[in-house]
């Protein structure tokens, strides 16, 4: 069978919404009203790694675009994007390891860690429309907890 | 044994609100994925709320979105659902089930309990 | 949404018979399918998932298959227990949505 994908949307646990910042960014900021249609809608991909009770690998692709979150080398670090595919061989259960994310449910968290980078989180900043990145600490000042809606197709 | 028991259920006015419970025992609780699935009068199955095991995932489909709140308390074993401006369509079996998103079946059911919504 | 169709509705069998039930969906949903069984004042009870792998304690008298976007449920020797309501369910994609219900009897 094909890799399933459902629909979903993630707050950050501040409450803080992900939106598109230009074409290849997200953002998080607070969003009220008819300002919350703005918000990115994912489609999350079901794919293969290493699974348990509280992990489960993921792809996170935005809905109807050929967009994935993907983790890559930038200058030494480890570094979130927005990557452009081939939409007629994505999404598919075997994702190379850059757009595989484990994600982790642990009392009332979740998070998304980096198969690529273990250790490595997708983040937000505490304040206001700041990019959405990848970082390597978790318990600081940047916040790695998130909360997810899943959306009918 | 594995089991959940629903309570909470009754006759209410369209508009007004209800909090449905279901303690589970026999499973670790915390572990799995919950759902509420409901049953009209002699009709067929329609899953309504789902909440992730940690209770950080949500779902809900659109004939009761912005309506009803799922939630759990893991330290108590309890799933409830909030049921906010009723409407004589939610009247009701309403089912607590382990499963939801993920795994996509249901294999433990509580016994159910009715939901009325008639002035 | 994706729609799931059940026929018959409702059937008739006698004790030892081969009972077939057929749910098709609207769209393809690649395997992504469970049975339940729901007896009369009862809860539903999960019978078949994925398809056609069976759940925990059911009896090897039923069973599950698929062929393009119809799928199909059977009870190979059909036994007075057997006396409810089936019902498939889909989880391809969201919202996951129940068949309307296969009323089976007995003659």
């Known amino acids: 069978a094909p890799v399933r994908s459902l629909n979903c949307t993630l707050r950050d646990s501040q409450q803080k919404s992900l939106v598109m910042s230009g074409p290849y960014e997200l953002k998080a900021l607070h969003l009220q009203g008819q300002d919350m249609e703005q918000q990115v809608v994912f489609s999350m991909s079901f794919v293969q790694g290493e699974e348990s009770n509280d992990k489960i690998p993921v792809a996170l692709g935005l809905k109807e675009k050929n967009l994935y979150l993907s983790c890559v080398l930038k200058d030494d670090k480890p570094t979130l994007q927005l990557e452009s595919v081939d939409p007629k061989n994505y999404p598919k259960k075997k994702m190379e390891k850059r757009f595989v994310f484990n994600k982790i449910e642990i009392n009332n968290k979740l998070e998304f860690e980096s198969a690529q980078f273990p250790n490595w989180y997708i983040s937000t900043s505490q304040a206001e429309n700041m990019p959405v990145f990848l970082g390597g600490t978790k318990g600081g000042q940047d916040i790695t907890d998130f909360t997810m809606q899943f959306v009918s197709s | 044994e594995v089991q959940l028991v629903e309570s909470g259920g009754g006759v209410v006015q369209p508009g007004r609100s209800l909090r449905l419970s279901c303690s589970s025992s026999g499973f670790i609780f915390s572990r799995y994925d919950m759902s509420w699935v409901r049953q009209a009068p002699g009709k067929g199955l329609e899953w309504v709320a789902y909440?992730?095991?940690?209770?950080?995932?949500?779902y809900y489909p659109d004939t009761v979105k912005g309506r009803f709140t799922i939630s759990r308390d893991n330290s108590k074993n309890t799933l409830f659902l909030q049921m906010d401006s009723l409407r004589p369509e939610d009247t009701g079996v309403y089912y607590c089930?382990?499963?939801?998103?993920?795994?996509?079946?249901?294999?433990?059911w509580g016994q159910g309990t009715p939901v009325t919504v008639s002035s | 949404d994706i729609q799931m169709t059940q026929s018959p509705s409702s059937l008739s069998a006698s004790v030892g018979d081969r009972v077939t039930i057929t749910c098709r969906a609207s769209g393809n949903i690649y395997t992504y399918l469970n049975w339940y069984q729901q007896t009369p004042g009862k809860a539903p009870k999960l019978l078949i998932y994925d398809a056609k792998t069976l759940a925990d304690g059911v009896p090897s008298r039923f069973s599950g298959s698929s062929s393009g976007t119809d799928y199909t449920f059977t009870i190979s020797s059909l036994q007075p227990e057997d006396i409810a309501t089936y019902y498939c369910?889909?989880?391809?994609?969201?919202?996951?949505?129940f068949g309307q219900g296969t009323k089976l009897q007995i003659t």
């Open positions: 909440i992730s095991h940690g209770g950080a995932g949500t």
């Open positions: 369910q889909h989880f391809w994609r969201l919202p996951y949505t």
């Open positions: 089930a382990r499963g939801g998103v993920y795994k996509g079946y249901f294999d433990v």
